[in-house]
């Protein structure tokens, strides 16, 4: 359950603490590819790579949909998968790609007007870690939200990226997600050198917008592995 | 250009209390949330405490929760950590980031909290 994979505090993978971001030195702040919170994850290591486990969709990346590893496989035993590109098969919405939604079986680019109608989705927070509102009042949260003519807007809650408007992706903050700006050319993205290895993100990214990819800046290939800047660029 | 500077810590007999402060300046976005994290020597970076301005709500580790309050004020760009009953091993550099609109997550560069026995 997602609540046994929240079970640690320990930060992984993050830039070095002082003297500013690879590739700004002395500057007051750090940009972080990303916070991370890995949890309780044993088999989260970058030198000894296995596959990430999970229950449910949600505890995987943006680009990653939780499913057992082989085709009728035991589903007791489910890992973080590759999401499935435009005309790949799917059998559901977090089997295709950020862009894409799953019809008839097949994932396709969710451009198409497609509108998923009404969520309602109950989360009932009950994690490792407190979660109390600002003004102290019940910690359990209905999602109820009519997708039929507008999508979430930056900052509003989600469960997915088709839930949000153009230009947004449904990125972790804390413990729930909520619709943020998809990244543009130069902004720092976050680039998850083996799959399993990135942890639950606190403050997660949107990945690369259309035409761009997550790449190592070109003058930081010098730079030590755990300091390396992506950001996101041109094709 | 942002930056996040932290303020409060210092040395501090167990049972004791210190208020932690980070004041972002620079800003010309919004910020969804910003966090206090700590690293003692030898271990990892682990979360302590985090604010969602965006959802309105407030995050703790169990390690803290109970003994550490979390508050701030979005407009004024600043994040507060209230530390009571304050133990050896709450002992390590405390760090805020920040969950910025613009993409990029902000580090400040750390205070110290020292709690002795």
């Known amino acids: 359950t997602l609540n046994s994979v929240l079970n640690s505090n320990a930060i992984k993978n993050l830039p070095p603490p002082l003297g500013g971001a690879a590739g700004h030195p002395g500057s007051a702040v750090s940009a972080a590819p990303g916070i991370l919170y890995p949890g309780g994850n044993k088999y989260q290591t970058i030198d000894n790579y296995q596959p990430y486990p999970c229950a449910e969709d949600e505890e995987c990346g943006t680009d990653e949909y939780c499913a057992s590893p082989t085709r009728g496989g035991d589903a007791g035993v489910q890992i973080c998968l590759a999401c499935r590109k435009r005309r790949k098969r799917c059998m559901r919405h977090a089997m295709c790609c950020p862009g894409n939604y799953c019809k008839n079986g097949i994932c396709v680019s969710s451009d198409q007007n497609h509108f998923r109608g009404e969520i309602e989705e109950t989360i009932t927070e009950s994690f490792g870690n407190d979660h109390s509102t600002l003004d102290g009042y019940s910690r359990r949260t209905t999602l109820s939200s009519k997708m039929y003519h507008t999508k979430g807007q930056e900052g509003s809650v989600c469960l997915r990226s088709s839930d949000c408007a153009s230009g947004l992706c449904c990125a972790r903050h804390f413990w729930s997600k909520i619709c943020k700006p998809v990244l543009k050319e130069g902004q720092v993205c976050t680039k998850h050198r083996r799959k399993g290895s990135h942890g639950l993100e606190i403050f997660q990214r949107c990945y690369c917008g259309e035409g761009l990819s997550c790449r190592i800046q070109k003058d930081h290939h010098q730079a030590s592995n755990s300091s390396r800047l992506h950001t996101c660029q041109r094709h | 250009e942002v930056q996040l500077v932290e303020s409060g810590g210092g040395l501090v007999q167990a049972g004791g209390s210190l208020r932690l402060s980070c004041a972002a300046s620079?800003?010309?976005?919004?910020?969804?949330?910003m966090g206090w994290f700590r690293q003692a020597p030898g271990k990892e970076r682990e979360f302590v405490a985090g604010?969602?301005?965006?959802?309105?709500?407030?995050y703790y580790a169990d390690s803290v929760k109970g003994r550490f309050t979390i508050s701030g004020d979005n407009a004024k760009n600043t994040v507060y950590l209230q530390m009571n009953s304050l133990k050896p091993e709450d002992t390590a550099i405390y760090y805020c980031?920040?969950?910025?609109?613009?993409?990029?997550?902000?580090w400040g560069q750390g205070t110290q909290v020292t709690v002795s026995s």
């Open positions: 604010i969602s301005w965006t959802l309105g709500r407030t």
């Open positions: 620079g800003r010309t976005f919004s910020s969804y949330g």
């Open positions: 980031a920040s969950d910025e609109s613009d993409a990029y997550n902000y």
